[in-house]
């Protein structure tokens, strides 16, 4: 267990807009050393978002997740207290980060900065990697359900954290609630891969759960207020596509934000399926400022591939 200096693993430059708690599975608080306090939310698609702890919806979401975690515990759910370095999940899940999320490499002077191009939410889903919260992030304690990414979770734009493939140095996020559908928030966060000492009082508990039968695509997001976007039928769809750039507004404006995707599975930015317009309610991709994910690719041992966020643009065809 590490007992070194607690380092700010995740910094948030933007806060996400509203995300339904139904799409959230866990939350954590960033470290005090980060300066600006933020809540890091994880969606059922294992996407991370930065949220403002002062906002009522964030308070309500945390309460809801806490209740769920408590209910799980009462029903036999088990918690695994993890201090220091948390072992990553073994199963990769789709993951992505919002523009405002940045992963900081652990102890290496170098880092690669990603400037993701807009990626389709579906493409993100296709990534099959799940973001892991670095250790040192405190969170609600709860059991984590199987890290199976579900449909893309939509979320406010510009506040989603990038998903990071599980790496030995990455800490697993604790899930405060069972997997539930939830939009991905757009929050820029910098996540350092280096394990940091976690204050026991801020430790999050993680419940181990079975791995998904297969990688699920990253959460997709419709651009709220823009009507449904087509659903792509090609192979890059949900399972192979990633989140789309989103707005930084509320849930309805959750359009995916451009995010850099750290995926174990390289995803081509081309071939993003175009979706046919859907009856309604899909987000159109809005490219926002790219999120910069700084991390040492070698350390992660994964390919960091920016994926264009086009899901919102094409939901189903």
């Amino acid at each position: 267990q590490h007992h070194g200096v607690t380092k700010c693993n995740i910094t948030c430059s933007k806060m996400t807009s509203k995300i339904p708690v139904a799409l959230l599975i866990h939350y954590q608080q960033n470290q005090a050393s980060c300066g600006k306090r933020a809540i890091i939310l994880e969606t059922r698609q294992h996407r991370l978002f930065c949220a403002d702890p002062k906002e009522q919806w964030v308070k309500d979401a945390m309460q809801h997740l806490d209740r769920q975690a408590a209910a799980l515990t009462r029903n036999g759910g088990t918690f695994e207290k993890q201090i220091g370095e948390v072992k990553p999940r073994t199963t990769p899940a789709a993951g992505g980060m919002d523009e405002s999320v940045v992963l900081e490499p652990e102890a290496t002077g170098e880092s690669s900065s990603l400037e993701p191009t807009p990626s389709s939410q579906e493409a993100q889903r296709a990534l099959g990697t799940s973001p892991e919260l670095p250790t040192g992030v405190t969170g609600s304690s709860g059991t984590r359900l199987p890290p199976t990414p579900k449909a893309q979770d939509g979320g406010p734009v510009g506040t989603e954290l990038f998903r990071v493939p599980p790496v030995s140095t990455a800490a697993t996020w604790q899930s405060s609630a069972p997997h539930q559908p939830g939009p991905s928030l757009w929050a820029e966060a910098k996540t350092s891969e280096a394990p940091s000492t976690q204050d026991p009082s801020t430790q999050a508990s993680t419940a181990s759960s079975p791995a998904p039968e297969e990688n699920a695509p990253s959460e997709g997001q419709r651009v709220w207020g823009q009507g449904q976007s087509p659903r792509p039928e090609n192979s890059l769809e949900r399972e192979e596509m990633g989140p789309v750039p989103a707005h930084t507004d509320a849930f309805q404006d959750w359009g995916p934000g451009s995010m850099a995707h750290v995926s174990v599975v390289p995803v081509s930015s081309e071939g993003t399926p175009s979706r046919e317009p859907v009856a309604s309610g899909s987000w159109t991709p809005k490219a926002e400022e790219p999120i910069h994910a700084t991390m040492d690719p070698q350390r992660l041992g994964v390919l960091i591939t920016p994926v264009p966020d086009a899901q919102a643009a094409t939901r189903r065809q």
Partner: antibody
Framework: QVQLVQSGAEVKKPGASVKVSCKAS????????IHWVRQAPGQGLEWIGW????????KFNERFKGRTTLTRDKSTNTAYMELSSLRSDDTAVYFC????????????WGQGTTVTVSS | DIQMTQSPSSLSASVGDRVTITCRAS??????LAWYQQKPGKAPKFLVY???TLADGVPSRFSGSGSGTQYTLTISSLQPEDFATYFC?????????FGGGTKVEIK
């Protein structure tokens, strides 16, 4: 275009089970949640649960946990909802629906499958 | 669970009338509300999401508004094809719940 086509009407006896299918087309099946909603005669709508076709993981309304099974067959782009230990108050139209990934509202619906439970 | 209460349960109106349907949630659903229209023997049709965003192809005479626990669906000028039953649905938290429905009938 997105389409959800459900299986035909069923008449079952109390205590029996029923399995309703929902075949999806027009989009990538594994990318969107499939939800099941029921509507008793002259009543409102009740959410049963969802399944994520990508990995087969389900989530249920607690009211239906224990006697509802949600599955899918990716090779045929079909989702299934099986309800066991049927009672007369399970008589309803069962709908499958799918929605965006940024929130679970339902933009596409199947035509509905009427399940009648009667002795 | 969040309960959704719709009112009125039914109303009679004439073509051209302005109609307002209310949906009240037992807790704050943060605008994660959808509205559907259903005609006899048919599946619901998606109208509005996120409290006020119209689904594709939905006429502009429909509008949604509200916040917190109170939401409304307004039809500015009722048309013959609008006579149907309307349901609200919250998608803030699971289990997703629907209002009991409002039947809009011809006066």
């Amino acid at each position: 275009q997105v389409q959800l086509v459900q299986s035909g009407a069923e008449v079952k006896k109390p205590g029996a089970s029923v399995k309703v299918s929902c075949k999806a087309s027009g989009y990538t099946f594994t990318n969107y949640y499939i939800h099941w909603v029921r509507q008793a005669p002259g009543q409102g709508l009740e959410w049963i649960g969802w399944i994520y076709p990508g990995d087969g993981s389900p989530k249920f309304n607690e009211r239906f946990k224990g006697r509802t099974t949600l599955t899918r067959d990716k090779s045929t782009n079909t989702a299934y909802m099986e309800l066991s230990s049927l009672r007369s108050d399970d008589t309803a139209v069962y709908f499958c629906a799918t929605g965006p990934t940024d929130g679970d509202y339902f933009d596409y619906w199947g035509q509905g499958t009427t399940v009648t439970v009667s002795s | 669970d969040i309960q959704m209460t719709q009112s009125p349960s039914s109303l009679s109106a004439s073509v051209g009338d302005r109609v307002t349907i209310t949906c009240r949630a037992s807790g704050n659903i943060h605008n994660f509300l959808a509205w559907y229209q259903q005609k006899p023997g048919k599946a619901p049709k998606f109208l509005v999401y996120n409290e006020k965003t119209l689904a594709d192809g939905v006429p502009s005479r429909f509008s949604g508004s509200g916040s917190g626990t109170q939401y409304t669906l307004t039809i500015s000028s009722l048309q013959p094809e609008d006579f149907a039953t309307y349901f609200c649905q919250q998608f803030w938290s699971t289990p997703y719940t629907f209002g009991g429905g409002t039947k809009v009938e011809i006066k």
